[in-house]
């Protein structure tokens, strides 16, 4: 069944309470526009955002009988001329009579007549109508023939994109058959279709078809009010392409539209071939979109590649939410033109700073005020990491301007990094020289402490990503952070007693659930000695608070339990609820304290692995005193297993030094120069590109490094955790169904095969990755069973 027939069937279902063969139609309030009711329009009770009233009429081909419910009688079948009267197209019938078309459509043959309704004739320009009436034998006859086809074609035969030769000089009739059931002929809507006649079929349309002989190019060349657009099209080498065959839709900005543009913006775009071509192509669709087919908001891809949203508000058409179409449906032989009173500027023609929306104005204002905007050169490439307006507190805004400038510099990258270029473990360099880490989670991407929200865009000289908070690059290690905060003095002393200090000092990627001194309330010095005395017990307890991988609370899907494997080996349960992180259902007191080697979440209770039994009465007594949220198992004689710490020592990158370094004796006042020659370092890692793991080999050519004293600069080189670059497909901000996610082992930045699909914008589904094809990074440990 065709779309038209499906919508008609829906209308019939909605009208069946009124009797047989009754169809429900919706009329837009304040207009004469009626539509067969689609499911969507029925439930919305509106078309084009305007309220509708429901009318019940006989379905096409049926009629009422006096004293009977509904439309039980079938309409009489007649020749095409008689059928014009049956469907109420009496003006077209009259014109068919006076133009001597009548005998043709009463006689032998098979015809399709697209008959303008009486109202359509009334709406026709009076000069054109007078011209037809003054020359009925030629002009009127030709005009009517241009509404006819030499064979019977029902709506099911009227396929989208079809061009049918009319009975006047074979001039084309452009058929469009849209998914919402609207069928148009040269953008005139079929308002009553499929009225069968003995020698054909009649479709009533809502306007008179005017003759089409010109292309879009011809129209642009002839129309003085489009001279700015025409000149821009010539500059962009696009005018000629609008003369070619096709089914285009052109949203043509008038000269007034160009006048509204800030001069500097237009000058810059027109001076840049790439940007000016993008600007022009953004006004063109490769499909024919008649205004009558727009009954609600829909997104269309432009020739430029980005999308525009075309909507409607009563009789007006809006583009990207703004009412701007002031003349609709200028039909040409290769498409349709709608005149618009604003120039549409695609992101790809905008400077990176112009990509910011209403929610990032504080950021862009500050960038301008603090003189950073001038460093964003039109020919450079940048990435703005723009926090939303409410990320800037009054305290931040009242900071010393130099400090504020440094903060803002942390939000501008030296290179253009698109959303799909981001991967877990990536290091990004800011214009201030700071290094920012990227963390990719199931439904979020975070840079340092701040996670992205929807709305990433790519412009002419860069990209913009939107963030919930101000990005704060870490300055201190986990150990240093704990040491500078008195709240963690007991935990820190236990950590040092367990010989675990180094673990939190060295480079790495960790999540630490750090218990405050409150967690140890009531612990006596004897009990402390008891705990320290059993090193294995102490290590097990402390390492249960540490998880490989950086897990930012804001990166978690709200309301979903995330099960992580701790360094100790047992599972820990994390859940984000109402901006609060729950750790084993205990509320975190503070979360997302970033460090150079991980993140700290503060807890005020000691955590303990529920699956590990205690075999010592005194220790059990102490743990029961400190831990109230679980019942600790007691198994007499059981001991804590030793945890081999070698697994957690950071991996080092070995640099081969060819031969001994050269040293020379130097006089006082000279500097020491140590020249190290070395082979290139080959780095291998896996990136998931379009859903398929691809092993990438990166050769870092190690040039001579000259280390000069007395101010010795050095470079520490080490491999981080397993870097798996993900080309992400869909970035969901939505809260999805409350599912428990099971993440075990590794650095935890895992994607279930199906979930890659859900991550980043764009609906392209990722290919399914077979489980055995998942390639692991250099420092990943084995993954145990995983389940959804």
């Amino acid at each position: 069944n065709s779309y038209y027939d499906k919508v008609l069937a829906h209308s019939r279902i909605r009208g069946r309470d009124q009797g047989p063969n009754v169809c429900a139609l919706q009329q837009i309030l304040g207009t004469k526009k009626k539509y067969f009711s689609s499911c969507k329009n029925w439930y919305q009770g509106a078309i084009c955002g305007k309220k509708t009233t429901v009318l019940y009429e006989c379905c096409p081909g049926y009629m009422r009988m006096e004293g009977m419910k509904g439309c039980p009688a079938v309409m009489p079948i007649d020749h095409v001329y008689g059928t014009l009267g049956i469907v109420g197209a009496t003006t077209t019938q009259h014109y068919s009579d006076v133009s001597k078309l009548r005998e043709e459509i009463e006689g032998k043959g098979s015809y399709t007549y697209f008959a303008p309704s009486n109202e359509a004739w009334e709406n026709l320009d009076s000069d054109i109508r007078r011209g037809l009436e003054n020359n009925v034998n030629v002009e009127l006859l030709n005009a009517l023939h241009s509404h006819m086809v030499n064979k019977r074609m029902l709506t099911k035969d009227l396929k989208h994109g079809m061009v049918i030769p009319s009975m006047y000089n074979n001039l084309g009739l452009f058929i469009n058959h849209y998914p919402n059931g609207v069928v148009t002929v040269n953008c005139a809507r079929v308002i009553h279709g499929n009225q069968i006649a003995t020698n054909g079929v009649v479709h009533v349309i809502d306007r008179v078809l005017t003759q089409i002989g010109t292309s879009i190019q011809d129209f642009l060349e002839a129309e003085d009010d489009l001279s700015s657009f025409r000149a821009a099209a010539i500059t962009s080498d696009l005018l000629e392409s609008l003369g070619r065959d096709g089914h285009f839709t052109l949203f043509a900005p008038t000269n007034e539209a160009f006048e509204k543009l800030p001069r500097g913006v237009l000058e810059r775009i027109m001076g840049d071939k790439v940007a000016s071509e993008a600007l022009m192509k953004y006004h063109i669709l490769n499909t024919l979109q008649c205004s009558e087919a727009i009954t609600g908001g829909a997104v269309f891809e432009t020739m430029e590649g980005n999308t525009i949203e075309i909507g409607c508000e009563g009789d007006s058409i809006s583009i990207n939410g703004i009412k701007m179409v002031n003349k609709k449906d200028i039909v040409t032989k290769n498409g349709v033109i709608h005149l618009i009173d604003e120039v549409l500027i695609p992101d790809s023609a905008k400077q990176v700073i112009e990509l910011a929306g209403k929610q990032q104005t504080t950021f862009t204002d500050l960038v301008a005020q603090l003189g950073l905007a001038s460093s964003l050169k039109p020919d450079g490439e940048y990435t703005l990491l723009a926090p939303v307006n409410n990320a800037f507190s009054d305290d931040t805004l009242s900071m010393d301007q130099r400090l504020l400038k440094l903060i803002l510099q942390n939000h501008i990258l030296k290179v253009k990094v698109g959303l799909s270029d981001l991967y877990n473990g990536q290091i990004l360099e800011t214009i201030g020289g700071k290094q920012l880490r990227v963390f990719v989670y199931r439904t979020a991407i975070c840079i340092e402490n701040s996670c992205m929200v929807r709305g990433s865009k790519q412009g002419r000289n860069g990209a913009i990503h939107i963030f919930r908070e101000i990005i704060q690059p870490a300055e201190k290690s986990l150990h240093d952070k704990l040491r500078q905060d008195k709240r963690f003095s007991i935990f820190l002393s236990l950590l040092e007693a367990a010989d675990l200090k180094d673990l939190l000092t060295q480079p790495g990627d960790w999540t630490l659930f750090a218990p405050t001194n409150d967690a140890f309330k009531g612990m006596t010095s004897e009990e402390r000695e008891l705990l320290i005395g059993d090193k294995n017990a102490l290590q097990n307890i402390i390492l249960y608070h540490l998880t490989p991988g950086v897990y930012i609370g804001k990166g978690f899907e709200p309301g979903v339990t995330n099960i992580l494997k701790t360094t100790q080996g047992s599972k820990i349960y994390l859940k984000g609820v109402n901006e609060t992180l729950l750790v084993n259902e205990l509320k975190s007191k503070e979360s997302d304290i970033m460090t150079t080697n991980g993140v700290i979440h503060v807890v005020d209770k000691l955590l303990y692995p529920a699956d590990i039994p205690v075999g010592n009465d005194q220790l059990l007594e102490l743990l029961n005193k400190l831990i109230k949220y679980i019942q600790i198992k007691f198994v007499r004689g059981s001991t804590f297993k030793e945890i081999p710490m070698t697994v957690y020592r950071p991996a080092m990158t070995k640099i081969q030094i060819e031969g001994d370094p050269d040293f020379r004796l130097i006089k006082e006042g000279e500097t020491v120069t140590e020249v190290i020659h070395g082979e290139p370092v080959i780095k291998k890692y896996t990136k998931i590109i379009d859903g398929v793991p691809v092993e990438i080999t990166e050769k870092q050519t190690r040039e001579e490094r000259i280390i000069t004293g007395p101010e010795i600069k050095y470079t520490r080189i080490s491999t981080g955790g397993g870097e798996t670059g993900e080309t992400l497909q869909k970035f969901l901000q939505k809260e999805v169904s409350k599912v428990t996610k099971f993440i075990e082992g590794g650095d935890g930045h895992l994607f279930e095969d199906e979930e890659i699909k859900r991550l980043l914008q764009g609906d392209t589904p990722a290919k399914k990755i077979p489980a055995n094809k998942r390639v692991q990074g250099p420092r990943r440990r084995s993954r145990e069973g995983r389940s959804q």
């Epitope: 001279s227 007034e256 006048e259 500097g264 810059r268 000016s276």
Partner: antibody, heavy 118, light 110 residues
Framework: QVQLVQSGAEVKKPGASVKVSCKAS????????ISWVRQAPGQGLEWMGW????????NYAQKLQGRVTMTTDTSTSTAYMELRSLRSDDTAVYYC???????????WGQGTLVTVSS | QSVLTQSSSASGTPGQTVTVSCSGS????????VNWYQQLPGTAPKLLIY???QRPSGVPDRFSGSKSGTSASLAISGLQSADEADYYC???????????FGSGTKVTVL
């Protein structure tokens, strides 16, 4: 055809004001802007500013900000440029030009000589 | 003091090609398009080239424009005596938010 006809020559004393008119014909006046450009004797061209005939939006050269006012009268398809606090270095030929933005200054008026002399 | 720099004069014999250069900065020519105007002696200027290399209708194809980085040039091939005039380059300047002209180049046909 497109024509821009400017008012006649003016002689003004320093400190006075001058108002030059530019009547447009042969095109839809509100569909284009008007720019004003001046040329001192034996010198190059200097852009003074622009006005959109569609909505009266203006953009003046920084140098003249506060001294120049550009207006349009759509009923007569005429653009005006008023320059106040005249100085001797304002002596120049003042041109109006149709400004399509995409195609800047595609048609020019014949010019109006303004002489500032005490 | 013009923001765009042009050589003060250029000359050639009939039939020759003459090139007029125009130098600017990243805030004008570097970021925006260049337009060229011809001013015959005693007349108003006339648009010759817009958007770096586009000729308005009626301008012979002997005139061609190009832009590279922060400089632009106008080439006049098949030089004719009627081409004797002043030639001005112009561009929008982002930093000044002003439309700036070059100092002008007088082309003489020998």
């Amino acid at each position: 055809q497109v024509q821009l006809v400017q008012s006649g020559a003016e002689v003004k004393k320093p400190g006075a004001s001058v108002k030059v008119s530019c009547k447009a014909s042969g095109y839809t006046f509100t569909s284009y802007g008007i720019s004003w450009v001046r040329q001192a004797p034996g010198q190059g061209l200097e852009w003074m500013g622009w006005i959109s005939a569609y909505d009266g939006n203006t953009n003046y050269a920084q140098k003249l900000q506060g001294r120049v006012t550009m207006t349009t009268d759509t009923s007569t398809s005429t653009a005006y440029m008023e320059l106040r606090s005249l100085r001797s270095d304002d002596t120049a030929v003042y041109y109006c030009a149709r400004d399509m933005l995409v195609v800047p200054f595609d048609y020019w008026g014949q010019g109006t000589l303004v002489t500032v002399s005490s | 003091q013009s923001v765009l720099t042009q050589s003060s004069s250029a000359s050639g014999t009939p039939g020759q090609t003459v090139t007029v250069s125009c130098s600017g900065s990243s805030s004008d020519i570097g970021s925006n398009r260049v337009n060229w105007y011809q001013q015959l002696p005693g007349t108003a200027p006339k648009l010759l080239i817009y958007s770096n290399d586009q000729r308005p209708s009626g301008v012979p194809d002997r005139f061609s424009g190009s832009k590279s980085g922060t400089s632009a040039s106008l080439a006049i091939s098949g030089l004719q005596s009627a081409d004797e005039a002043d030639y001005y380059c112009a561009a929008w300047d982002d930093s000044l938010s002003t439309y700036v002209f070059g100092s002008g180049t007088k082309v003489t046909v020998l």
